[in-house]
Amino acid sequence: MAVTACQGLGFVVSLIGIAGIIAATCMDQWSTQDLYNNPVTAVFNYQGLWRSCVRESSGFTECRGYFTLLGLPAMLQAVRALMIVGIVLGAIGLLVSIFALKCIRIGSMEDSAKANMTLTSGIMFIVSGLCAIAGVSVFANMLVTNFWMSTANMYTGMGGMVQTVQTRYTFGAALFVGWVAGGLTLIGGVMMCIACRGLAPEETNYKAVSYHASGHSVAYKPGGFKASTGFGSNTKNKKIYDGGARTEDEVQSYPSKHDYV
């Protein structure tokens, strides 16, 4: 039960985190005009990864996309790449984790397979969260570096002109969304990895040893009482296609990397 809860919670936390990473990536407010100790402009400038915007005093807002790829700073490109990689990994992780959820039964998928998928999705979430945190942190560092520069824009030459008005930029809302979202995705991934350990086929303490037909080598797991045949054949005269409704001792246990954790 605790494993299912941990896995489910990990999935939900990661889902929220990835939604946040997507939101942060799409947001325009990665950097916002610093209003403190600055010339008071009648327009408010803010910039995202994909476009820059201006809000006029009337509230009218106009945005312009960065219609150049080569003209953009390498750091901005790197941040874009990190965020996209984070989203892609997170999306794949979500897809994998849906099938790995213990509460969802798909065909005759075994616990070991679900454990593998849970671990895979957990690792994906961790990497996704790290990508987002790294991307946001790189951008934040870029802002701090440029904050004291005398040029008007953080991206000199991006607009084709350098303003003489010293517009300084500070952290925008997207940075905080990105940090929180990346953190949530990371936490969700860790929870999935923890859940994976509990999902690995556990050694069940049977009151009696299962006896199999002679002629088969019987392998006993160290420290456990669960027996399994060396060949994985169906030793009882039962239909194999029983729709997945097998008794516990009918399920064949195969060694996996989780068995000796």
Partner: antibody
Framework: EVQLVESGGGLVQPGGSLRLSCAVS????????MHWVRQAPGKGLEWVAY????????YYADSVKGRFTVSRDNAKNSLYLQMNSLRAEDTAVYYC????????????WGQGTLVTVSS | DIVMTQSPDSLAVSLGERVTMNCKSS????????????LTWYQQKPGQPPKLLIY???TRESGVPDRFSGSGSGTDFTLTISSVQAEDVAVYYC?????????FGQGTKLEIK
Amino acid sequence: EVQLVESGGGLVQPGGSLRLSCAVSGFTFSSFGMHWVRQAPGKGLEWVAYISSGTTNIYYADSVKGRFTVSRDNAKNSLYLQMNSLRAEDTAVYYCVRSGYYGNSLDYWGQGTLVTVSS
Amino acid sequence: DIVMTQSPDSLAVSLGERVTMNCKSSQSLFSSGNQRNYLTWYQQKPGQPPKLLIYWASTRESGVPDRFSGSGSGTDFTLTISSVQAEDVAVYYCQNVYIYPLTFGQGTKLEIK
């Protein structure tokens, strides 16, 4: 039709005070920022003050800072300019102006009210 | 404060003639965020309040005849009247609407010969 009607101008002694009013009609007053602009007789235009639609942002020209106060009453569709410590150089026609939706332009102007500061 | 300087102070032209007047700002009025220049042109006829002609340095206000056009970027701007009419006699002002205080130029007076 957009209409801006200024009132409250007149003759005042140096050091005196005056309160200008601007009655607005023909548009949703609470949605627009408003400016005061003045023009000394035979001279050019001088921007005086700005107040945003929700009074969050208020800006003044250096020449009037600390002496003039701009305010608005959205319920009464009215804009005000409280002028204290008046000087001879404040003598001008004062225009109430609406801040346009695009380009921070000053799109609708009142007819103006004359303020004369003289002893 | 941004200083706006207009030239010439006055000019006299014949009807139908093309006229240009200039406005120079002490700082750039260009906003890279939306690639716009925050400069506005006004026309003030004798005894009347000013009237908005052009905003964003080159966008005509609705109802303004197309003989009026604005151009320029950064610190240098121009107002052009392609074919001067009698009703164009006025003083033309440019204004910085980018940084407070929103300063005006001293004006260019247009007269007919």
